[in-house]
Amino acid sequence: QEEDLPRPSISAEPGTVIPLGSHVTFVCRGPVGVQTFRLERESRSTYNDTEDVSQASPSESEARFRIDSVSEGNAGPYRCIYYKPPKWSEQSDYLELLVKETSGGPDSPDTEPGSSAGPTQRPSDNSHNEHAPASQGLKAEHLYHHHHHH
């Protein structure tokens, strides 16, 4: 493969299994020089952009997308892309967000830590969830459906 731009990676903090009403932050990472990170909900037509990009390391930049209070409608696959002028990157692999009812039981952890999808791993083997259009990014009102977006 010829690869002009490295694929971004996506991870979720504190994990990909989030109790209803709790917060989750998606972290998108790419090379230095990224101008815009985009978090897409399943397809390219539903996304949230940010230019609030920070340097994670000498060779890597990142952006964070927080959902303050997750609902069942937030469940589903998410992926990242970035714009490093003058090009958009390929998408990251998908990361599947699972939202669970809070059980309160001490034997069931609230999250799966360290969940990520990036250029060095196979697509995650999570079953596909049927889901309604969901919110992502900072708050529900920050969700945008776009037909032509770049």
Epitope: Q1, E2, E3, D4, L5, R7, E40, E42, S43, R44, S45, P77, R79, I81, K87, W88, S89, E90, D93, Y94, P119, T120, Q121, R122, P123, S124, D125, N126, S127, H128, E130, H147, H148, H149, H150
Partner: antibody
């Protein structure tokens, strides 16, 4: 309306080279689509050749196609497939396809009508 | 190398019946699986994407499902217009393995 059109199909002799073109209209390559080539021999199934990401430039090939087939983006509306050392087994209809604008997981939603390549002496 | 093994190669069923087509991936491909319908002399048409999601304008008689690395296309209440060849495809293009491979196709004949 969004569309793809293949061109360049021809009757050529074994050992020859040929370049096919796929011209896009109604959408922008800068949006970052997977532009793919798929072929179908007469009476046979679909066979994936490879894809290029129209913005980043990343290219992916089927293992059997590496070396003899080259996919390139030659303009903001055109992708090409260069084929060399052609044999009778390469006789097929060659399709250009693009992944979806509105669906996730990269399915080929938009297809051209195909162009016929015949290899015969 | 990723291989998609599609079965059966052909099937014949009466109008109103049900056809089940299976596609086995040689490795984990998550939900990067699409199903297409192709009629003679025509370009393929997308039916199912993401293993189980129905493309716009496609009849709900077509249903996709997944169990591990086995994917299934089920066509219920068969109509004459369903006579065609159906293909699965892995739609993952990435750095760990190269997707893109199609299954061998299933020709559906309506009695």
């Amino acid at each position: 309306e969004q569309s793809l059109e293949e061109s360049g199909g021809d009757l050529v002799k074994p050992g020859a080279s040929l370049t096919l073109a796929c011209t896009a209209s109604g959408f922008s390559f800068s949006d970052g689509y997977y532009m793919c080539w798929v072929r179908q021999a007469p009476g046979k199934g679909l066979e994936w050749i490879g894809c290029i990401h129209s913005s980043s430039g990343s290219i992916y090939y089927a293992s059997w196609a590496k070396g003899r087939f080259t996919i390139s983006k030659t303009s903001s509306t055109m992708v090409t497939l260069q084929m060399s050392s052609l044999t009778a087994a390469d006789t097929a209809t060659y399709f250009c396809a693009r992944d979806s604008e509105s669906y996730g997981y990269n399915p080929c939603e938009l297809w051209g009508p195909g162009t016929l390549v015949t290899i015969s002496s | 190398e990723l291989v998609m093994t599609q079965t059966p190669a052909s099937v014949s069923e009466a109008v109103g019946g049900t056809v089940t087509i299976k596609c086995q991936a040689s490795q984990t491909i998550s939900n990067y699986l699409a199903w297409y319908q192709q009629k003679p002399g025509q370009r393929p048409k997308l039916l199912i994407y993401a293993a189980s999601s129905l493309a716009s304008g496609v009849s709900s008689r077509f249903r996709g499902s997944r169990s591990g690395t086995e994917y299934t296309l089920t066509i219920t209440d068969l109509e004459c217009d369903d006579a065609a060849t159906y293909y699965c495809q892995c739609t993952y293009y990435g750095t760990t393995y190269i997707g893109g491979a199609f299954g061998g196709g299933t020709e559906v004949e309506i009695k």
